[in-house]
């Protein structure tokens, strides 16, 4: 058993049929010595008396808010949560496996630049009685500070018969130099509590590996005389690290119709303009990627050919 | 250290091309190592990230773009000299660069060159003959060093009398290649920045 926060405790349980469970001793936070009784949740049934209560925790029915009273007055609470371990593996029931970039990916993180600011998100099908708490650091043995905000519900989607909820959090490394060469990864830890179930999820990464620039901005077209070709120009996104001559991007320019199966014109360039062939009912799209360290491409910025 | 006088160079900043070749060569070599050594811990997640130049050179600090010198977090160990030299620079661009930066890059390359050559000598003794260093990568390191044109003391190639542990050598190769790729990215950014100045 360990303390998650004040008056909230996590009991780690090996989860298998007829498992013996864990013996837990609760102590009432009071100077009083006698006349103390214990109850669980909203029940008025007295579970025991005395300053300490010993319980055998085996299942969710044994978890919950234990309260010690004296003469009708509440003295203190202890909330017990369960953390299940099945076949030596901690449960991951609360969050959905996003399977990208690999299986068992519950947390996904992205950074728009090298400033040390990043966003992580996760998915769940649970809509109520759910809380998250996020901590982060650079390295684990001698951790350096990363400050995370509160996790918030950022999107809701319908997937078949199920509703899916996306939560996200923003974090900022306390003293980040955009030009630094990372040797210690960022660690992100998410505590998830659903009703009386506790789970924790972690992710470890270098900012350089989670870079995904914003799409290029201000796409403009200029038809070339006596040709089917069009000059398309754009600018670096505002959120990208500066100076741009140091933090350079490379671009992919594509002309395509509405369907992905349609024919297309595609060209890669380090410049902020390119010449392509425009077709009727097609659109020109441009996306960006770090020129020197190939992490993710940005989303496409698009303009219609016409 | 004897710093040569910068000679004007027509056209493109001459080291940019070499640095692009360097990044390409080390990225290819790393990819080859990850494929060939698939049953060794050779991915970014699996290896320890060591920097053999730590406390010996200060490339990131010395080559920091002027725009980032206002960032407190970038100035931990900055001893910046704004005097420039080295044959990579056309004279009209000298005010945009520090001798310290180019010489620091040169020292990085020299240290990695020695490590890679020592390691290759060991890998050539491996009866499995599983992986060797790409000669192209070693040649590209040499070309960039020549373009930088700094004279410095020759570092003797390390020779080891004891029997090499090929498993450890291959893991060390992965660690070195990952670190060198990160440094090659920095070098490329620096050269691009200087080229634009």
């Amino acid at each position: 058993i360990w303390e998650l926060k004040k008056d909230v405790y996590v009991v780690e349980l090996d989860w298998y049929p007829d498992a013996p469970g864990e013996m837990v001793v609760l102590t009432c936070d009071t100077p009083e010595e006698d006349g103390i009784t214990w109850t669980l949740d909203q029940s008025s049934e007295v579970l025991g008396s005395g300053k300490t209560l010993t319980i055998q925790v085996k299942e969710f029915g044994d978890a919950g808010q234990y309260t010690c009273h004296k003469g009708g007055e509440v003295l203190s609470h202890s909330l017990l949560l369960l953390h299940k371990k099945e076949d030596g593996i901690w449960s991951t029931d609360i969050l959905k496996d996003q399977k990208e970039p690999k299986n068992k990916t519950f947390l996904r993180c992205e950074a728009k630049n090298y400033s040390g600011r990043f966003t992580c998100w996760w998915l769940t099908t649970i809509s109520t009685d759910l809380t998250f708490s996020v901590k982060s650091s650079r390295g684990s043995s001698d951790p350096q500070g990363v400050t995370c905000g509160a996790a918030t519900l950022s999107a809701e989607r319908v997937r078949g018969d199920n509703k899916e909820y996306e939560y996200s959090v923003e974090c900022q490394e306390d003293s980040a130099c955009p030009a630094a060469e990372e040797s210690l990864p960022i660690e992100v830890m998410v505590d998830a509590v659903h009703k009386l179930k506790y789970e924790n999820y972690t992710s470890s990464f270098f900012i350089r590996d989670i870079i995904k620039p914003d799409p290029p901005k201000n796409l403009q077209l200029k038809p070339l005389k006596n040709s089917r070709q069009v000059e398309v120009s754009w600018e670096y996104p505002d959120t990208w690290s500066t100076p741009h001559s140091y933090f350079s991007l490379t671009f992919c320019v594509q002309v395509q119709g509405k369907s992905k199966r349609e024919k297309k014109d595609r060209v890669f360039t380090d410049k902020t303009s390119a010449t392509v062939i425009c077709r009727k009912n097609a659109s020109i799209s441009v996306r960006a990627q770090d020129r020197y360290y190939s992490s993710s491409w940005s989303e496409w910025a698009s303009v219609p050919c016409s | 250290r004897n710093l040569p006088v910068a000679t004007p160079d027509p056209g493109m900043f001459p080291c940019l091309h070499h640095s692009q070749n360097l990044l390409r060569a080390v990225s290819n070599m790393l990819q080859k190592a990850r494929q060939t050594l698939e049953f060794y811990p050779c991915t970014s997640e699996e290896i320890d990230h060591e920097d053999i130049t730590k406390d010996k050179t200060s490339t990131v600090e010395a080559c920091l773009p002027l725009e980032l010198t206002k960032n407190e977090s970038c100035l931990n160990s900055r001893e910046t000299s704004f005097i420039t030299n080295g044959s990579c620079l056309a004279s009209r661009k000298t005010s945009f660069m520090m001798a310290l930066c180019l010489s620091s890059i040169y020292e990085d390359l020299k240290m990695y060159q020695v490590e890679f050559k020592t390691m290759n000598a060991k890998l050539l003794m491996d009866p499995k003959r599983q992986i060797f260093l790409d000669q192209n990568m070693l040649a590209v390191i040499d070309e960039l060093m020549q373009a930088l044109n700094f004279n410095s003391e020759t570092v003797p190639q390390k020779s080891s009398l004891e029997e090499p542990d090929f498993y450890k050598t291959k893991i060390k190769l992965c660690i070195l290649l990952h670190a060198f790729r990160i440094r090659a990215v920095t070098i490329d950014r620096v050269m691009s920045y200087l080229n634009a100045s």
């Epitope: 199966r261 349609e262 024919k263 014109d265 595609r266 890669f268 062939i277 | -």
Partner: antibody, heavy 118, light 107 residues
Framework: QVQLVQSGAEVKKPGSSVKVSCKAS????????LHWVRQAPGQGQEWMGW????????EYAPKFQGRVTITADESTSTAYMELSSLRSEDTAVYYC???????????WGQGTLVTVSS | DIVMTQSPLSLPVTPGEPASISCRAS??????LHWYQQKPGQQPRLLIA???QSISGVPSRFSGSGSGTDFTLTISSLQPEDFATYYC?????????FGQGTKVEIK
Amino acid sequence: QVQLVQSGAEVKKPGSSVKVSCKASGGTFSDYYLHWVRQAPGQGQEWMGWIDPENGDTEYAPKFQGRVTITADESTSTAYMELSSLRSEDTAVYYCARNKELRYFDVWGQGTLVTVSS
Amino acid sequence: DIVMTQSPLSLPVTPGEPASISCRASQSISINLHWYQQKPGQQPRLLIAFASQSISGVPSRFSGSGSGTDFTLTISSLQPEDFATYYCQQSNSFPLTFGQGTKVEIK
């Protein structure tokens, strides 16, 4: 299986014209760009131009501009390349090639040898 | 027009050995570079697109690298069927242009 089948070899006199055909099978004809590339004996390839069979749009290499005409007949899934004012240096194998991507070629015809000789 | 220069023009190789062919562009073409193989009397066959993207059906011993002006096609271990002429082609701008070819011959 996508295939491009070209017409047979031709022998032409200098100053005349030649029209080579390229019939496509497998896949929808108008879903691909169609190019013509030539290869003179012992030489590398030379790109001549492309056509979008969907709308008839064409683009020609400046070297052949005014001398080459590329057309397409959607009903028969056939493209044509006509080269006029032939000279001896036009002796080459002419290939049609196609792709959904405009600027490179993933399927090639077997080639048509055009010999220009007096 | 962008001029593509291949080297060497002829490359004698022992079967089972690796081979590397170089292609240089007269100006920067990013990764807009494609590789083809051509055997005598046959049409070209696409091997690599956009400098390093493998093509389905092409053996994994063929790989490409490079960007800007310098590109390399590498065959990790030459098989008897790989003896042929190899061409690079740029797609950075029209007109599309090819290298003059590198003939890989049996040593």
